[in-house]
Interface confidence: medium
């Protein structure tokens, strides 16, 4: 059966949160990726900018994760208009930042 | 610089009614959300109550729902509680707390008062 | 509602490291706030949104939260660290602010 909303936002939180603790060595090389605004469509903005990271097995579950929240196909090098311009960040702080949002949403109730 | 001053603590008896005021300064009173939390002689902080940043929406403890109401004027900067059929169990120090708003919940509570006492006694 | 349980009492050394604990439900999906609180003085945030620190709180202060339970560490502690230290969280269910039932902190 589906997994319910509030279930599935709290795993990718839960996966998040074991990221940020885990991280010994940083993230993923020091990655960059682009900042996205997180004011709307957070999921598939979140997952347009992660895609372009690869070899990089400890966001490859929440690259998973953020794919079930996202309604529509993402593939590397897509970018949508949520993308904060020419503003690069790295994959950890980026990690960060949406670990916060997320919970905010949560906090909210707000699941879809 | 920015503050909270609470005022209207007293003595009243149980079943009586008192109203706190909190008069902010030094910052934008109207962009914050605003908090009413208690403390009983030597116990432990109590959410009483919030009202969001234009007014529009308040939640209450629900030891206090249906008794005490929390109102704000922005164009004075004061926040107010007006606390009805008083019970002993309501005997604190009220503070008033500033919090910042993200949607319909409330941000950590970065600014306090130093607190108004009131004790309920016969 | 919802329900953060802490630990009452806490005693340690000068120089050592204090750990207060706050446990609820799934805590981790939550963000928790802490706050210190001295006798006769108003509480003071010191570290929120987990793990971030406002201007003024010393590094020593350093929060984590995950599974079921966040932790407010204090690194070197100090006699000026004795106080009450409270954990706190909104509430989506019943639009509540909630607090923890506060942790005494004694340093010996």
């Known amino acids: 059966s589906p997994v319910p909303p509030s279930t599935a936002l709290k795993e990718l939180i839960e996966e998040l949160v074991n990221i940020t603790q885990n991280q010994k060595a940083p993230l993923c090389n020091g990655s960059m990726v682009w900042s996205i605004n997180l004011t709307a469509g957070v999921y598939c903005a979140a997952l347009e900018s992660l895609i372009n990271v690869s070899g990089c097995s400890a966001i490859e579950k929440t690259q998973r994760m953020l794919n079930g929240f996202c309604p529509h196909k993402v593939s590397a090098g897509q970018f949508s208009s949520l993308r904060v311009r020419d503003t690069k960040i790295e994959v950890a702080q980026f990690v960060k930042d949406l670990l916060v949002h997320l919970k905010k949403l949560f906090r909210e109730g707000q699941f879809n | 610089q920015m503050q909270l001053v609470e005022s209207g603590g007293g003595v009243v008896q149980p079943g009586r009614s008192l109203r706190l005021s909190c008069a902010a300064s030094?910052?934008?009173?109207?962009?914050?959300?605003m908090h009413w939390v208690r403390q009983a002689p030597g116990k432990g902080l109590e959410w009483v109550a919030v009202i969001w940043d234009d007014g529009s929406n308040t939640h209450y403890a629900d030891s206090v729902k249906g008794r005490f109401t929390i109102t704000r004027d922005n164009s004075k900067n004061t926040l107010n509680l007006q606390m009805n059929s008083l019970r002993a169990e309501d005997t604190a120090v009220y503070y008033c707390v500033r919090a910042p708003q993200w949607y319909l919940s409330a941000e950590a509570f970065d600014l306090w008062g130093q607190g108004t006492m009131v004790t309920v006694s016969s | 509602s919802y329900v953060l349980t802490q630990p009452p009492s806490v005693s340690v050394a000068p120089g050592e490291t204090a750990t207060i604990t706050c446990g609820g439900n799934?805590?981790?999906?939550?963000?928790v706030h802490w706050y210190q609180q001295k006798p006769g003085q108003a509480p003071l945030l010191v570290i929120y949104?987990?793990?971030d620190r406002p201007a003024r709180i010393p590094e020593r202060f350093s929060g984590s939260n995950s599974g079921n339970t966040a932790t407010l560490t204090i690194s070197r502690v100090e006699a000026g660290d004795e106080a009450d230290y409270y954990c706190q969280v909104w509430d989506h269910n019943s639009d509540h602010m909630v607090f923890g039932g506060g942790t005494k902190l004694t340093v010996l």
């Open positions: 799934m805590i981790g999906a939550y963000l």
């Open positions: 030094g910052f934008a009173f109207r962009t914050y959300g």
């Open positions: 949104d987990d793990v």
